[in-house]
Interface confidence: medium
């Protein structure tokens, strides 16, 4: 933004005629006090916007703060803003007017403030004095702001000399406004009721002996006043209990409540609110998803988490294969069910050193007497594999056959590999990938079963080799999601006469 | 909760009077300050006269010696006695109650129109 004059100060003559020009790359817009004078918007041929603020006929009254700023970014940074202070020294106008309320300066802390009395012209002498007092005090002066420091609560006004006449400004009042001693709380025996049941509600005021309780509740509102009991909490000094009770809630009962303190001695006061809600019947609501196949690791501990909110607080009960499920005595499942919140509640069923037949069809079931939900999951049990037998077989085909058998669950996938050169075979030399598109001759047939009893695959591949000439290392590996297992065998050509 | 009702506006001639009325009900602490302010259109609004509980009254430049503010303690209500009127004092004058304490929040009014003819 450039600013012609660039100011940032300006001291004009009063009855004259003066020119403000800005000018940016985006549309900009003179403000003065907040408000847009009427000026000339226009665009340049190379792009360039500018605003001009002819200011006619000056007063006193003109003097002050004038921003040019892009039209878009009021309440920017004030990199986006220029400033500029113009004065119109006017000897028929003492100190600018104030709003009413401008002449009030409140305060909650000692901090530094600004007494805002000034004047049309930066020549003049001004001082500040306690209304009641000619001393003038030793603060320092801005004439573009005023008298900034450290108050007093008293009442304070401005001086100037205007040719031969003295000038006062209004006074101004320095009021240090009372903080709160009061310490409320609310709470609520519950903040969701069914419509039928009670609404309680208590206001606690701590450390004031002689206090007033106000609520402000829905029914109130209506017209329908209901009397809050006040009574003292012996066992704490100066603990106050106001009770707000409402007997057979409606569903209009839902709300804000809120209980207003005033405290009489010192006139402090505090209010505290709280939210309740009078639903028609109670519910009961699942949180978040649960996959419908949940997995577990053989021999390791998993805990399945179902997050549900529910009121009334819910009966919870888990069942297997259509089984109620209990906490067992061998410490094998353990249940549990947690409040979090007023009305979400947590359920868990843990299985400790889970076992292939903790496999199965689970169900959870939250329900009380307005409504239920249920969640259901299979869980599948996983089994590292384990290769259980490896073999070399020479039928009288005249080929030789290596088998292969593992379990796991998952089902695993079988990986058959050979390496010729056995003193480099594998630390330096990858194994040969074998099967039905290897460069060996050699033929691949597996099978697999799923044993319903154990719950996982068993593999069983036969490697079919036509030529052996020398002596291979053939290596079997089972892997699934959860591990990997490897054999190897030697397999020797029918001429050689051992076999390792 | 503190809820404002004025009264006392209406059409007046130019160089006349008029008075108006402010009662403040509800939570009424004290200290406090209750105010008498417009807003032109197109303008900020200007609070142009202010008294507080504790007895201090301010106005703004451009009313000082034709309004005056008071105060009715016991009946919870603030006046505004507008003399010497002109056309440009035509506004919706409100009231409002704030208060003197760390915090406290403005109450206004829905304010009261005054119309001076000239």
């Known amino acids: 933004l450039v600013v012609t004059p660039p100011g940032p100060e300006l001291v004009l003559n009063v009855s004259s005629t003066f020119v403000l020009t800005c000018s940016g790359s985006a549309p900009v817009v003179w403000e003065r006090m907040s408000q847009e004078p009427p000026q000339e918007m226009a665009k340049a041929q190379d792009g360039t916007f500018s605003s001009v603020l002819t200011l006619t006929n000056l007063t006193g009254l003109d003097t002050g703060e004038y921003f040019c700023t892009h039209n878009d970014s009021r309440g920017l940074e004030t990199d986006e803003r220029k400033r500029l202070y113009i004065f119109v020294p006017d000897p028929t106008v003492g100190f600018l007017p104030n709003d009413a309320e401008e002449l009030f300066i409140f305060l909650t802390e000692i901090t530094e403030i600004t007494i805002p009395c000034r004047v049309t012209d930066p020549q003049l002498v001004v001082t500040l004095h306690e209304k009641k007092g000619d001393v003038a005090l030793p603060v320092p002066y801005d004439h573009q702001r005023g008298f900034s420091g450290i108050f007093e609560d008293r009442s304070y006004i401005c001086k100037t000399t205007i040719g031969d006449r003295e000038v006062d400004s209004d006074a101004y009042y320095v009021y240090r406004l009372q903080v709160s001693s009061i310490n409320v709380s609310v709470n609520a025996v519950q903040t969701v009721v069914r419509q039928g049941e009670n609404i309680t509600l208590m206001c606690i005021v701590i450390g004031n002996e002689v206090v007033n309780f106000e609520w402000t509740y829905p029914r109130k509102e209506s017209g329908r006043l209901v009397e809050p009991v006040t009574d003292f909490l012996l066992d704490m000094p100066y603990h106050i209990r106001s009770i707000l009770h409402i007997p057979s809630a409606e569903l209009e009962d839902s709300g804000t409540y809120t209980c207003n303190v005033t405290e009489s001695v010192n006139d402090h006061q505090d209010e505290k609110a709280i939210n309740i809600t009078v639903v028609e019947s109670g519910y009961v609501r699942l949180l978040g998803e649960v996959g419908t196949l949940q997995f577990a690791e053989l021999h390791r501990s998993r805990t399945l988490q179902v997050v549900f909110e529910a009121y009334p607080p819910p009966t919870v009960l888990w069942f297997k294969d259509n089984r109620t499920l209990g906490d067992s005595s061998a410490g094998e499942i353990a249940l549990s069910t947690r409040n979090v919140s007023e009305t979400r509640y947590v359920s868990e069923l843990t299985l400790v050193r889970v076992k292939v037949a903790e496999a199965g069809h689970y169900t959870m079931r939250a329900f009380h007497e307005d409504a239920e939900v249920q969640l259901s999951f299979q869980l599948q049990i996983n089994v590292p594999v384990r290769v259980l037998e490896l073999s070399e077989s020479h039928p009288d085909s005249g080929e030789q056959t290596v088998r292969c058998r593992g379990r796991g669950m998952p089902q695993p996938n079988i990986i058959w590999s050979a390496c010729r050169d056995l003193k480099r075979c594998p630390r330096e030399l990858p194994p040969t990938l074998l099967g039905n598109s290897s460069e060996e001759e050699s033929q691949l047939e597996t099978n697999v079963t799923y044993w319903e009893e154990e719950q996982e695959f068993e593999v069983v591949s036969t490697l079919r080799l036509q030529h052996v000439d020398r002596p291979l290392s053939v290596r079997c590996t089972l892997r699934n999601a959860v591990g990997q297992d490897t054999q190897e065998v030697i397999v020797v050509p029918h001429s050689l006469p051992f076999k390792v | 909760e503190v809820q404002l009702v004025e009264s006392g506006g209406g059409l007046v001639q130019a160089g006349g009077s008029a008075r108006l009325s402010c009662a403040a009900s509800?939570?009424?602490?004290?200290?406090?300050?209750m105010a008498w302010s417009r807003q032109a259109p197109g303008k900020q609004r200007e609070v142009v006269a202010l008294?507080?509980?504790?007895?201090?009254?301010t106005y703004a430049t451009s009313v000082k010696g034709r309004f005056t503010i008071s105060r009715d303690d016991a009946k919870n209500t603030v006046y505004l006695q507008m003399n010497s009127l002109k056309p440009e004092d035509t506004n919706l004058y409100t009231c409002?109650?704030?208060?003197?304490?760390?915090?406290?929040?403005?109450?206004w009014g829905q304010g009261t129109q005054v119309t001076v003819s000239s």
């Open positions: 409002k109650y704030r208060a003197l304490r760390a915090g406290a929040v403005d109450y």
């Open positions: 509800g939570s009424i602490l004290s200290p406090n300050l």
């Open positions: 008294a507080t509980s504790d007895g201090i009254t």
